[in-house]
Interface confidence: medium
């Protein structure tokens, strides 16, 4: 199936009848919470760094004859080294995260030769997307965060072809579809309404959607499942 | 002299202070950038291998094929006999899966299905051979001695293999090596 079969429209029903998913809904509070949490982390970190700067400035600007200049220079030198290490870490870690080297020497050789950088190593490619196929089990919220930290998003399914492919390789995994309660519509983590069939939707405790051997089904968001992440190339 | 020393240390302190401030600013920017990336679906920034990226075909697989490590795999959802599977793979300029090691299909380790692979018994060599003529490593399937020579081999990504009549219809995996 070509990818045009499902798009997200901005007006009323899909602009034409084969195109299914709807515009973002007003009620996307769950994902907004997630975004708020992320923003909170960001602001907190910035605040920490600002506080640090502020404290340093006040100390530096005070004339403290009782403290030997050598000591001040030494402290500043140590702070500089710590900051430099932090900068290096932040610059280096993301690339090492996305390029975990395989221990086997044969694989390392061939992987270096053919890894084009379309996707991080150990991820798979399929139809212009990269997928991280997780082995560990997490709750839906933990999975969402784990994927966000991998610079990607929790598995989204764009068409039936992709769903069939994913069920073939991994039939039980979280997807980026949830609802606030059984009285609310299903939405994607981007806030788009999700109209594809989700089995067991009438269970009020099942508010997160998972990929299942025969399509999508709802489950408890707190239960632990394997998770996959995806980003589009 | 003491005044000079004091001035020197103050100069060193001042320089270090400026370096600290600039490093702090850099750190602030880096932190902001790395956390801005935590949006729900950020644009993915490819790795540093720019030279290889220029040649976009160097490791792209055909649509509907899976790229993993240095190979492309076609994982069928329909079932065919072993021979039909082999012909299909050949028509796609690939061959039925030849396993390099037991964790080659790691990415689909939770799949329940069995798939035809490119292993068949050669009467001439009295051995199980891959399509390219290489012999089966005994470490790959410890149970291979129980395989019936007239049968073909279906493999499960959990590492299990079973021999079945070649006329049985199974899913299949084609493989293309990129390099």
């Amino acid at each position: 199936m070509d990818n045009q079969g499902v798009i997200y429209s901005d007006l009323n029903l899909p602009p034409n009848p084969k195109r299914k998913q709807q515009k973002p809904k007003g009620n996307t509070s769950s994902i907004l919470v997630t975004e708020q949490e992320i923003t909170y982390v960001e602001l907190n970190l910035q605040k920490t760094s600002q506080d640090f700067q502020g404290n340093y400035k006040t100390n530096h600007c005070k004339d403290l004859p009782s403290v030997p200049e050598k000591l001040i220079a030494g402290i500043l030198g140590i702070i500089c080294l710590i900051l430099m290490a932090s900068v290096v870490t932040i610059v280096v870690i993301p690339s090492t995260l996305t390029q975990k080297h395989n221990n086997s020497s044969l694989n390392t050789r061939t992987q270096k030769a053919c890894h084009c950088g379309h996707c991080p190593e150990e991820w798979i490619t399929y139809s212009n997307s990269c997928y991280y196929i997780g082995k560990e089990k997490r709750t839906w919220a933990e999975s969402l965060l784990a994927c966000t930290l991998k610079n990607s998003s929790l598995l989204s399914i764009d068409n039936e072809e992709e769903m069939k492919f994913l069920t073939a390789i991994s039939p039980s995994t979280w997807t980026g579809v949830f609802r606030d309660s059984s009285q609310h519509p299903w939405v994607t983590i981007n806030g788009l309404t999700f109209k594809h069939e989700i089995k067991d939707s009438d269970n009020a405790e099942h508010n997160c959607a998972m990929l299942h051997a025969r399509g999508l089904k709802s489950d408890r968001c707190g239960s632990s499942k394997i998770y996959h992440c995806k980003h589009k190339l | 002299m003491a005044v000079f020393k004091t001035t020197l240390w103050r100069l060193i302190s001042g320089t270090l202070g400026i370096i600290c401030l600039s490093l702090m600013a850099t750190l602030g920017i880096l932190l902001k950038n790395s956390f801005t990336k935590l949006s729900v679906e950020p644009a993915y920034t490819p790795g540093p291998n720019i030279e290889l990226q220029k040649d976009s075909d160097c490791c792209s697989c055909h649509e509907k094929w899976v790229g993993y490590r240095c190979n492309c795999y076609f994982i069928s959802s329909e079932e065919k006999t072993w021979n039909e599977s082999r012909h299909f793979c050949a028509s796609q300029k690939s061959s039925l899966l030849q396993l390099q090691n037991r964790d080659e299909l790691d990415f689909m380790s939770s799949s329940q299905h069995f798939y035809w692979i490119g292993l068949s018994y050669s009467e001439e060599h009295t051995a199980w051979l891959w399509e390219n003529g290489s012999a089966l490593s005994q470490y790959l399937f410890p149970s291979f001695e129980t395989f019936k020579p007239k049968n073909c081999i279906a493999y499960n990504s959990k590492g299990n293999a079973l021999d079945e009549s070649c006329e049985t219809k199974n899913r299949y995996i084609c493989k293309q090596q990129l390099i």
């Epitope: 029903l13 009848p17 009285q183 519509p185 | -």
Partner: antibody, heavy 119, light 107 residues
Framework: EVQLQQSVAELVRPGASVKLSCTAS????????IDWVKQRPEQGLEWIGN????????KYAPKFQGKATITADTSSNTAYVQLSSLTSEDTAIYYC????????????WGQGTLVTVSA | DIKMTQSPSSMYASLGERVTITCKAS??????LSWFQQKPGKSPKTLIY???RLVDGVPSRFSGSGSGQNYSLTISSLEYEDMGIYYC?????????FGAGTKLELK
């Protein structure tokens, strides 16, 4: 189990209106689209229109614009079509159908309501 | 509106026979076509969607093909329970439009 329950029959006078219901069980109508289809006796199928119950957005075939009004009540998990200014031409079976996701346009059908317009 | 021309309007066939029904759209519908079966007094039942995909639970003797404007439904070996009326539907554009139907009867 997914089901769409419709009333069996309605007898109405010419010029009057009728409101047909389609009650869903086994799923929440907010999570799908509901379409309405008309079938006159011994004739083919005609698409009337559909609704997204999550927001009330509707689409109609030009022929049924002004004739049919599609609504939904999510609290009772029911979709409706109201037919106005009825004539003998409106005598037909009216089916509701549910979209099945991806490219399956009508995955589930109601059993149909026969509307007879007669003096 | 897209017009769907279905043929034949009715046909007689024997059990075990291969049967083909065709549908022609007045413009390219990008394979957004479904086939339905309807038996007397019953609701329609979806057999095929997206021109060639079989709905779960539908026997494999039914198959669909086609692209652009021309589509067909084939029953490889006719069985008694296959008697009924068959409709095609285009869902490439609103309004959705059905073919007039093909009545399939036993010879």
């Amino acid at each position: 189990e997914v089901q769409l329950q419709q009333s069996v029959a309605e007898l109405v006078r010419p010029g009057a209106s009728v409101k047909l219901s389609c009650t869903a069980s086994g799923f929440n109508i907010k999570n799908t689209y509901i379409d309405w289809v008309k079938q006159r006796p011994e004739q083919g199928l005609e698409w009337i229109g559909n609704i997204d119950p999550a927001n009330g957005n509707t689409k109609y075939a030009p022929k049924f614009q002004g004739k049919a009004t599609i609504t939904a009540d999510t609290s009772s998990n029911t979709a409706y079509v109201q037919l106005s200014s009825l004539t003998s031409e409106d005598t037909a079976i009216y089916y509701c159908a549910r979209w099945g996701g991806w490219d399956v346009r009508f995955a589930y059908w109601g059993q149909g309501t026969l509307v007879t317009v007669s003096a | 509106d897209i017009k769907m021309t279905q043929s034949p309007s009715s046909m007689y066939a024997s059990l075990g026979e291969r049967v083909t029904i065709t549908c022609k759209a007045s413009q390219d519908i990008n394979t957004y076509l479904s086939w339905f079966q309807q038996k007397p007094g019953k609701s329609p039942k979806t057999l095929i969607y997206r021109a060639n995909r079989l709905v779960d639970g539908v026997p494999s003797r039914f198959s669909g093909s086609g692209s652009g404007q021309n589509y067909s439904l084939t029953i490889s070996s006719l069985e008694y329970e296959d008697m009924g009326i068959y409709y095609c539907l285009q869902y490439d554009e609103f309004p959705l439009t059905f073919g007039a139907g093909t009545k399939l009867e036993l010879k």
